[in-house]
C-alpha cells in the first residue's frame, strides 16, 4: 500500500482543516488508514482523524481544530496499521479556503432595486470576519449567456443593483463566494443559490 498523491490540506481558519490524498489502488480509507495530526506546541497531544473515501483510491480527512492562529504548524503522519506511509507538515494560515457565505436573500421590494444580502460565515472574534470580500454570481435560468459576476470589495455582505440591469419577466439565480486577500486564500465554495423572478416597471418612452 502506497501513497500515489501526497496529502494536501486547506483550512477554513476556524475549526476544520480538510486533507485529501490518493492511494495507489482502491482503498477502504476508514478501516485501513489513520491520519495523525499534532499542533507543534508545548505539551500538545497527537489526535487521530479517520478518513473517508473520496472516489476509489481517494481519501479525505476532516481535521478538527480548536481555533487557528497565524503561527500554528501541524505535523501530519499517515498510517496504515503500524506502517508509516507519509510524514509531512501543514501550516493552516498558508492554506486557507474560507467558509462559504450563507443565507443569501434577494430583496425585491425596494423600488426598482435588487438588494442581495448574505451572512458572513465567521463569528466576529475570528480574524477573517473583517477581511472577507465577495463575488456575487447572477445568471439567467433561460439564457446561459446571461451570466455576470459582481465583485464586492467592501466589508458589508450586501449588493445593490438596479433591477433594470437584468431582463424583466424572467427568473434569475444568484450565489456568492468569499476570499480574503490578507492570507491570499483560495475562493470559498459557492453558497447555495437562490432564485427570484425579476420584474420591474419599464420606464415610459417619450416619442
Amino acid at each position: 500500500m502506497k501513497v500515489l498523491q501526497e496529502p494536501t490540506c486547506v483550512s477554513d481558519y476556524m475549526s476544520i482543516s480538510t486533507c485529501e490524498w490518493k492511494m495507489n489502488g482502491p482503498t477502504n480509507c476508514s478501516t485501513e488508514l489513520r491520519l495523525l495530526y499534532q499542533l507543534v506546541f508545548l505539551l500538545s497531544e497527537a489526535h487521530t482523524c479517520i478518513p473517508e473515501n473520496n472516489g476509489g483510491a481517494g481519501c479525505v480527512c476532516h481535521l478538527l481544530m480548536d481555533d487557528v492562529v497565524s503561527a500554528d504548524n501541524y505535523t501530519l503522519d499517515l498510517w496504515a496499521g503500524q506502517q508509516l506511509l507519509w510524514k509531512g507538515s501543514f501550516k493552516p494560515s498558508e492554506h486557507v479556503k474560507p467558509r462559504a457565505p450563507g443565507n443569501l436573500t434577494v430583496h425585491t421590494n425596494v423600488s426598482d432595486t435588487l438588494l442581495l444580502t448574505w451572512s458572513n460565515p465567521y463569528p466576529p472574534d475570528n480574524y477573517l470576519y473583517n477581511h472577507l470580500t465577495y463575488a456575487v454570481n447572477i445568471w439567467s435560468e433561460n439564457d446561459p449567456a446571461d451570466f455576470r459576476i459582481y465583485n464586492v470589495t467592501y466589508l458589508e455582505p450586501s449588493l445593490r443593483i438596479a433591477a433594470s440591469t437584468l431582463k424583466s419577466g424572467i427568473s434569475y439565480r444568484a450565489r456568492v463566494r468569499a476570499w480574503a486577500q490578507c492570507y491570499n486564500t483560495t475562493w470559498s465554495e459557492w453558497s447555495p443559490s437562490t432564485k427570484w423572478h425579476n420584474s420591474y416597471r419599464e420606464p415610459f418612452e417619450q416619442h
Epitope: 508545548l42 505539551l43 500538545s44 497531544e45 489526535h47 492562529v69 500554528d72
Partner: antibody
Framework: EVQLVESGGGLVQPGGSLRLSCAVS????????MSWVRQAPGKGLEWVSS????????YYADSVKGRFTISRDNSKNTVYLQMNSLRAEDTAVYYC??????????????????WGQGTTVTVSS | DIVMTQSPLSLPVTPGEPASISCRSS???????????LDWYLQKPGQSPQLLIY???NRAYGVPDRFSGSGSGTDFTLKISRVEAEDVGVYHC?????????FGQGTKVDIK
C-alpha cells in the same frame, strides 16, 4: 478540593536511584499535563520534566535527560519521576504541579495552578 | 533556552505601600493567539510556590485584587497595590511558552 501529595524522597548515595510519586485528586487527572519542579537548598526554582495527559508527550530539562524518567498511571491518578544515576546536584525539594489541559488540540494554559507540598531528595555519601 | 531576568532581587517594603517587580525575557513570550506565556508565583517561607498570575495578566482563583500583572512580549511587571504583611516571600516569574520552562532568579520581598 484539588490535592497533590508527593512521596518517595529520601537520602540516597551518588549513583543511586529513587522513584518519586505524586498522587492526585480533585480534578480529571487524564485531561491535564503534569510537571515536576525542584528547588535546591537556598536556590531558585528549576523545572525538571513534564508529561501530557495521555502520556504521549514528554519533556525533560537537559540536566536530567537520560537519567530521569517521567511517567503516569491515569487509572491510579498518579505521576512518577524515576531518578537514576543521582548526583549531589540533584539534592532538592521536588514538587509536582498541575499543568495545562493537554487533551484539546491546542493545550489550554492556566498556569501551574496547584502544587504538592514537596518531597526532599538528598544525594550524599 | 529562554533566560528570565528579575529585578530587583531584594525588595524591602512598607505595609500599605505599593511594590513592583520586573521580569524580562530573552525571547518574545507573546504567541500569535494573543497570550503572553508568563506566570508569577509567590513562595511564602516554608511553603510550596503558589500561582498568582498566569498568561501575563490573569489573576489566579482566590488571589487578592491588589496583585496585578502587566506587560507583553519581553517585559513584564508584577504590581502589589498595597503590600500586606502576608505578602512576604520570594516572587518568581516563569515562562511557559517553550521547553524548558525557565524561572527568574526570584525576588525576595520582606517588611522593612
Amino acid at each position: 478540593e484539588v490535592q497533590l501529595v508527593e512521596s518517595g524522597g529520601g537520602l540516597v548515595q551518588p549513583g543511586g536511584s529513587l522513584r518519586l510519586s505524586c498522587a492526585v485528586s480533585g480534578f480529571t487527572f487524564s485531561s491535564y499535563a503534569m510537571s515536576w519542579v525542584r528547588q535546591a537548598p537556598g536556590k531558585g526554582l528549576e523545572w525538571v520534566s513534564s508529561i501530557t495527559g495521555g502520556g504521549g508527550g514528554i519533556y525533560y530539562a537537559d540536566s536530567v535527560k537520560g537519567r530521569f524518567t517521567i511517567s503516569r498511571d491515569n487509572s491510579k491518578n498518579t505521576v512518577y519521576l524515576q531518578m537514576n544515576s543521582l548526583r549531589a546536584e540533584d539534592t532538592a525539594v521536588y514538587y509536582c504541579a498541575k499543568d495545562r489541559i493537554s487533551i484539546t488540540i491546542r493545550p489550554r494554559y492556566f498556569g501551574l495552578d496547584f502544587w504538592g507540598q514537596g518531597t526532599t531528595v538528598t544525594v550524599s555519601s | 533556552d529562554i533566560v528570565m531576568t528579575q529585578s530587583p532581587l531584594s525588595l524591602p517594603v512598607t505595609p500599605g505601600e505599593p511594590a513592583s517587580i520586573s521580569c524580562r525575557s530573552s525571547h518574545n513570550l507573546l504567541y500569535s493567539n494573543g497570550y503572553n506565556y508568563l506566570d508569577w508565583y509567590l513562595q511564602k517561607p516554608g511553603q510550596s510556590p503558589q500561582l498568582l498570575i498566569y498568561l501575563g495578566s490573569n489573576r489566579a482563583y482566590g488571589v487578592p485584587d491588589r496583585f496585578s500583572g502587566s506587560g507583553s512580549g519581553t517585559d513584564f511587571t508584577l504590581k502589589i497595590s498595597r503590600v500586606e504583611a502576608e505578602d512576604v516571600g520570594v516572587y518568581h516569574c516563569m515562562q511557559a511558552l517553550q521547553s524548558p520552562y525557565t524561572f527568574g532568579q526570584g525576588t525576595k520581598v520582606d517588611i522593612k
